[in-house]
């Protein structure tokens, strides 16, 4: 299904690569979804070229993209969810290049929010909660998040935890005493919908209590 | 306290087929992402597979794709792994483990897979 234009005033056209990639979001305003495409190589002159997507839709044949600066976005209630899109590349009315997608399959979460960490003395650990606005959903409902957290001092060691709920705790016996940590989380699509990793919730900072020496126990902070 | 049993392996011929079961306890299964690690004789941990709590998503070393399937049953509790065309490689110690990075602490006591004619 998918070509290079052959008309000669497109010459220069045929030259660019004009693979891109997108993704959906279910339900992202109300009932609301939204189709994001980008091309893969920024360096792409894109001042004439347009995204289309035709098929799988409900009362039209086809919908044309916004352009936002480099990207190239949708937001409709006329996905079917059913079967696949056809989205190409324009330039006028001729095709560069189309891919057959599935907008099931493209799905990207809405970043996790409200991420917190309590320290719960009497039981020696520390409850993690987040929030994700995927509980109120009518599709995407199903998420697998990524726990991410490290000792600030560590750059790059980050101990990740794959969980479907909102809610893990950290033994403190686990961490460091006296640490300073980050923490995040970001969610993928678990079930029947697939996609990608949505963006990393805003980091939270939290500190290890010190070790109380008469006990071996840390100090409350 | 986290309780993790492997079973199912043995001794079996090259080409052959094996599925290692892992029943767990102390926390909620459905919850957590589930990997198979195993560690060959002399050698470190490798990691074998990944599965997501629902299911959803699975992912494979380059060395097992196409040969094993990483499945699980939330219901029971139990996570498997069917591994088909087994080679004399695959020779292992094979561990289920919590998808937390911290292997070491998270695994059961593992079941012996022996691969030879």
């Known amino acids: 299904e998918s070509g290079y234009a052959q008309n000669g005033d497109l010459e220069d056209a045929e030259l660019d690569d004009y693979s891109f990639s997108c993704y959906s979001q279910l339900e992202v305003n109300g009932s609301q979804h939204s189709l994001t495409c980008a091309f893969e190589d920024p360096d792409v002159n894109i001042t004439n070229l347009e995204f289309e997507i035709c098929g799988a839709l409900v009362e039209v044949k086809c919908l044309n993209f916004r352009k936002l600066q480099e990207i190239y976005f949708i937001e409709t209630k006329k996905f079917l969810l059913i079967g696949k899109s056809n989205i190409c590349v324009k330039v006028g009315e001729k095709s560069l290049t189309c891919k057959k997608i599935d907008l099931t399959t493209i799905v990207k979460p809405e970043a996790p929010f409200d991420l917190s960490v309590v320290y719960r003395e009497g039981a020696n650990d520390f409850v993690v909660t987040f929030n994700t606005s995927h509980l109120q959903k009518k599709y995407v409902k199903v998420l697998m998040h990524d726990v991410a957290y490290r000792q600030e001092k560590d750059e790059n060691k980050w101990t990740h935890v794959n969980l479907s709920s909102t809610k893990l705790t950290l033994l403190q016996r686990k961490l460091q005493p006296a640490a300073m940590y980050e923490i995040k989380v970001r969610s993928i699509p678990d079930h029947y919908f697939k996609g990608f990793w949505s963006e990393w919730s805003p980091s939270y900072y939290f500190r290890t209590p010190e070790i109380n020496n008469s006990s071996g126990e840390m100090d409350p902070i | 306290q986290v309780q993790l049993v492997e079973s199912g392996g043995g001794l079996v011929q090259p080409g052959g087929s094996l599925r290692l079961s892992c029943t767990t306890s102390?926390?909620?299964?459905?919850?957590?992402?589930m990997k198979w690690v195993r560690q060959a004789p002399g050698k470190g941990l490798e990691w074998v597979a990944f599965?997501?709590?629902?299911?959803?998503?699975?992912d494979y070393a380059d060395s097992v794709k196409g040969r094993f399937t990483i499945s699980r049953d939330n219901a029971k509790e139990t996570l498997y792994l069917r591994m088909d065309s087994l080679k004399p490689e695959d020779t292992a110690v094979y561990y289920c483990?919590?998808?937390?990075?911290?292997?070491?602490?998270?695994r059961g006591q593992g079941t012996q897979v022996t691969v030879s004619s």
């Open positions: 483990a919590r998808g937390d990075s911290d292997t070491n602490n998270n």
């Open positions: 599965i997501s709590p629902a299911g959803g998503i699975t």
């Open positions: 102390g926390f909620t299964f459905t919850t957590y992402a």
